[in-house]
Each structure stands twice: as C-alpha cells, then as structure tokens.
Interface confidence: low
Amino acid sequence: GCLTQLYENAFFRGGDVASMYTPNAQYCQMRCTFHPRCLLFSFLPASSINDMEKRFGCFLKDSVTGTLPKVHRTGAVSGHSLKQCGHQISACHRDIYKGVDMRGVNFNVSKVSSVEECQKRCTSNIRCQFFSYATQTFHKAEYRNNCLLKYSPGGTPTAIKVLSNVESGFSLKPCALSEIGCHMNIFQHLAFSDVDVARVLTPDAFVCRTICTYHPNCLFFTFYTNVWKIESQRNVCLLKTSESGTPSSSTPQENTISGYSLLTCKRTLPEPCHSKIYPGVDFGGEELNVTFVKGVNVCQETCTKMIRCQFFTYSLLPEDCKEEKCKCFLRLSMDGSPTRIAYGTQGSSGYSLRLCNTGDNSVCTTKTSTR
Amino acid sequence: IVGGTNSSWGEWPWQVSLQVKLTAQRHLCGGSLIGHQWVLTAAHCFDGLPLQDVWRIYSGILNLSDITKDTPFSQIKEIIIHQNYKVSEGNHDIALIKLQAPLNYTEFQKPICLPSKGDTSTIYTNCWVTGWGFSKEKGEIQNILQKVNIPLVTNEECQKRYQDYKITQRMVCAGYKEGGKDACKGDSGGPLVCKHNGMWRLVGITSWGEGCARREQPGVYTKVAEYMDWILEKTQSSDGKAQMQSPA
C-alpha cells in the first residue's frame, strides 16, 4: 500500500540503486517514485553533513523485502516512494529554493525581473530542466537579475551549492504549464534522426511515447514495430533528443512509428503508467513471484499490489492452469521495461498500475517523527 | 566469452568497452561503471598502453558495430593502477579509471553495486561474466555483448588446477569442470557479477586463465571485495566526487 511517512534524523542503510542531488526531500521522494526500482530514499540536507560532496545527496534505494535498516543520522530525512499512492503521484514540483544554486549545463542566460519569470522561461524552453536566478541583491552587480536556464544528463542538478541571493527551481512542464504545446501526432512509417538518449523495449508506440514523456532528456522517439526487418530491433523504442529540440531529419521507413514527448502539453500529461493488456504477448524479465489467479485482470491487480512488480505475464498454457486459475508471472527489470517481448504465446501481458495517479488510495498514513 | 549468448539492452548497464584509438580503433578490454566518473577494470589492460589520451570508453552500448565516429565516448582523466601490480605477475590486477566528465545514469548506463569489504560469507550461486571478447581461443572480438552463467570455484580447487600459479585470497575463480564456458581474450577488465538477494554485485574483474574454456582450467578474477578499501580510498581522495555511496 501507500506509505507516505517521512523519517527524520534517519538514514536507510544500503540498497542504493542511484544517487543524485536534489534540493529537498520531497523532490528526492518524487525521483524515487518515478525510478523503476526505487522503494525507499534517504536525503541529506546541507545542515546534516559536513562532506560537501554529499550535501543535498538523494539516495534512491531498493530492497527485496521492501524495507531497509534505519540508522540515526542527525538532519537526514528518509521515506518511501509514492508508488501505489494514486493521486499523490506527480512529477510536478513548483517549489523555489532560496539561497541555493542548482548547477548544470548553462545553455541560456537572460535578464528578468523575478524568479517567477525565470521559472516561466524555463518552463517555456524545450530543453530547460531547472534554473537559477541571481536576485537584485546578488553580490556581483553584473550577475543581478540573471536567469540561467539549465539541463543535465540526468535531469537533476550535477551539484547544489548554498549561495546567498540566488534562487533555484525546476521547469513546470510536468505540471502541464508549458506554453510550448505538444505534437500529439503519431507518424507511421517514419524514423527520426538525432541522438539516442535511451533504448527500451515496449509493446507499442504509445508506451514508448509515455516513457519518452517521463524521461528527462527525451524530446521525441522512434519505435520499431514487431514486424521490423531486423529481429534484434523489434519492439525497440529509441528515446531521442537534439540541440534544436526537434528532429533534424526524418526518413520514410516501413514498420517504424515516430512521435514527440508530451511533456510540453498544455493541459494534462499522459499518466506515467500503461494500463493496456496485450493478448498473445510474453513480457520477459526477472521473476519476482509466480502465483495462481483467476483471469488476466486479477494478475494485473496482483502485480499492482506487489510494489516491486513492474509488469506481468498471465499464462493460459494448459500446464500452467489449475481449474479456473492460471499462472501469473510477476516480473521486473532494471529499467521497468520488459527485457524481451515475444509474440504468439498463449497468454497476455501488461504493466503494473502502481504509477497510475487515478488510483484511489485513501489510506495516507502521513506521519513524521516528532521534532 | 566462450559458450555465451547475446545480451539484451540494459541487461548489464555497468559494462563498458575500453577501446584504443591509434591508427585504427579497437576494443581491448571491458570495464565496469561503479560511479558517475569511475570505471573499474584490470591493471593488465594498460600493459604497454598507459597513455590515457589513446583510450576511448564506450558506455551504454550493446553492439560494437553500432559505434560510429559520432558515437559519444568518455575520455580518461586518470588511470590508477594498483600500486602492487607488476606486469610480470598476476597479483593485484585491478585499476580505476577516472573519467574526464561524469556520466549520467540511464537505463543502459548504470553502475554496478560493489560488495562489502572482505565479503567472504556470502555464497553466490548466480554469477555471470560479460564481454565482447573472443568466443574461442583463436577467435575474434564479438559485436554483440555476450553473457555466460558460470559457477564460482573454491580457491583450493582453483589452485589445484593452476599448480604453477599462486591463487591468492585476493582472487576468485569461476568455471565448469568440463570447460566450455569462460571469459576469453578481450573480456579482461570486465565484470563477474553475482546476484544475491535480488541485487547484482561486482564480485570479480576478469583477469586471466589458461587458454579459454578449457577443461579443468577455470577463469581467474580479481576479487573486488578484497580491494574495497583501496577502491574507496582512491575514489574519495581523488578530486571530484566519488560514487555517492550511502554514508551510513
């Protein structure tokens, strides 16, 4: 279920799957929520540690048991991912951090009158992920009112420094507040060029697009269908970017589908989950559990309830069934996508709905340790 | 890798290809990404090629034939070879590479967890070796990253098989009695990873062996757990941030 409590002065020991810099525990928790394997996180505010390299450190953690030992660490904040927390799941992060400089690649500098205007510029720039703004009282006069638009390879700052009269924050594109707008079109038999930022296996172009939308550096994608001529590239979803923000060229190519990230959509973003069930398809991955259930929908529910489960295959093979119940294979992978997609099988596959934010989780056991 | 199969995308996201660009460019060794700016490999990969600017490090790749002049690569900022390694010996066959620029972690480019210092109690039963090395003794570098599941062999058993070498406690061996599956030339420096409690750990660094996949001649790997102090000392004392391991 959904666990929203934060543990103050506590640090989860071990289980690291990734580390990054974040300005606060909530943003760290959001990164944990959207990380395919993160169940727990620990965050080190600037005040909690002398080691400059670990200040603002956000440690994303996994555990086969769903928990890790907590050790006392003054100032540290730990908690759970919000996977399975329904409407609380959001990539939107509006906070502005005063006295903090979030470092990254500065690709645009302009003079603006307020931090809000700087945030708006970031939100309306296709490549901007976060920003820093030097206020009117910044110690170097020539930098005052400078708005620095930034990006980084992982979408999070490469470093965070305490710096007076500087304010920082994130793009509000995940809040559906971008003025850019988005291309909803899906282009059949067209392949985009440019730089691949990641490669995953997906059953269709729509899953590919959703993954692109939530990938920090994906602006557009090309999906190779299951009848693509090169067997090893079938069902490959290539997440792409370019300097300009749009594909520099596109090539007519049978059995490919291309499209754009929907992160710049003005209204609502697609949910960060995939609810469709794919008949006759087997999703390969690491086996988490095998259970007998009645029907593919129950299999999907079972996967959704088991927090580490990312996707499933429900087998209808006679040897996998007992009366009305058949084997439900609960699976996971390093990146949340199947490691293999096979067709023509007796069964169906699909994804966990743990990141669907329409889920009604009324049990919000929000609790922080006493101060 | 002898007796292996093709890997799939993102299966071994810590695997990197160490390539040398002289007149031509070729893959020489594997390596393991252990932090944004750190790769762990074998010291012997640098025998005769200690110049860091001739090396190119490709991460997040599956197929070497996909590499073009436009494929991004990392360059070396620093090569740290274990102070006790000698070209003429097999001991301390371990080296750290500090990259000039930190790598972002993606689905296909992520670090491997390191074992606990002096990890001797864990019984690893699910171990894999990966690389683009030869698929037979007199073979050639493979295009697609290969993987092979190989059981660990006790040091006592390994010493019997290599009577004219010293198999130290800082080495770990893996192989089948009947041979057939093993690392080979070009896999050196790459990972021997074992899955325990759902987590992959870097147990060994491909180091040496008598031929490849020969009967009763297991592969010999540098035991990473025995070098944790050294790894942490070097990654944390070097300027720039080390892998952000949980300080707890």
Epitope: - | Q159, W208, G209
Partner: antibody, heavy 122, light 106 residues
Amino acid sequence: EVQLLESGGGLVQPGGSLRLSCAASGFTFSHYIMMWVRQAPGKGLEWVSGIYSSGGITVYADSVKGRFTISRDNSKNTLYLQMNSLRAEDTAVYYCAYRRTGVPRRDSFEIWGQGTMVTVSS
Amino acid sequence: DIQMTQSPSTLSASVGDRVTITCRASQSISSWLAWYQQKPGKAPNLLIYKASTLESGVPSRFSGSGSGTEFTLTISSLQPDDFATYYCQQYNTYWTFGQGTKVEIK
C-alpha cells in the same frame, strides 16, 4: 639482487639419504613456485620436483616419486629436497630454480642457483 | 607425459652463421615452450619463453617460433659467446626438457 644458493650435496652410498637446501634472497619467496632440476654428468637437464607458493601442492617426476620429498619454509625463505633411497642414477648437479608466476603469460625458470653436486656411489 | 625431441644433437657452425635448432613435442603444448642456453659448469640461462618472447636482456639475434608441436630457435648471426648447449622445455603439463643441442665451433 635475486639469488638462490644450494647446499647439502655430497657423497652418499646407494640406499642412503641426503637433504638439499636452497636459500633464496632478493624476492618475495612465499609468492613463487620453486623447482629442483638436475643434470647428470655430461647429460641434459631433468626436472625433478616443484612446490607451489603455499607449500600445499607438490609435484614430482616419475623417476623420483616416492623417494624424494620437496618442502619449503617461507619464514626462512628456504627450499628443501629430502632424498631417500638414493641410487647411482641420482648422481647429478642439483639446481634449484624459481619460476615467476606470470599472468596471463606463463613464464619459465628464470632464476637458477649455481647447483650442488650429489654423488651416489659405493 | 610429454616428450621433447631436439634436433640436431650437435651442430657445428662458424661465427656469423645463421643457426636453427628444432624441438618437437609428443603432443600439442600450445605456445608453452622455453629455450635455455647453458655453458659448461654453469646454470642454464633463459632465452625465450612462450615460444617466441625474448627474455629481458637477451640479444635480439635470438628468436623463437612455432606452436602446437613444432618449434624453432634461430640465432641469426652466431657470435663467439653463443657456443653452448641449448635446451627446449615445455611447460604445458608440468615440465620436460629436450635432450639438448650442442653448438660447437666448426
């Protein structure tokens, strides 16, 4: 400087025993395989026995198996060859040699002592 | 056991000559072969290991070749210091020496 110095050779009657020693210096003795190789007067080289670094593994040529015992004392940097039931055909110069453990190459006997003469005669 | 057969047993040559000694293994030993030089009353001296790798400090006129069962030691231009007995040795399975080749002055 790397050095190996054999001692303990001499004249012994058939059926008798002799213990050869080889004192090592200039290298980490405990890391290396050590060998005894012999050469009968006017003849070629014959490998006799080898012992691995820990001392746990010993190997012998068929001609001496069951009669000779190789051992080492790593704390004293010394190699030994206990020779029992000696025969006339064991008469030879006995060399101790060490073989650097080379990885992945396999090196051969690089360093040799000057030899000690063993004569088995009645 | 692996037997090593050297030929010729004796070789007469002059300074400046190119000299070739062959060594045959009774079964394949890959490249695990070494060549030694021995002078009267002295211990052997390693010249070449792994069939063709020159030991450090050995003059470049010495070279080795071969793999499997057939091996060759070549002295490109015989020098006065090279008159000695030469032994091959396999180290694929334990160790066996050839019977030696004596290179003498013609």
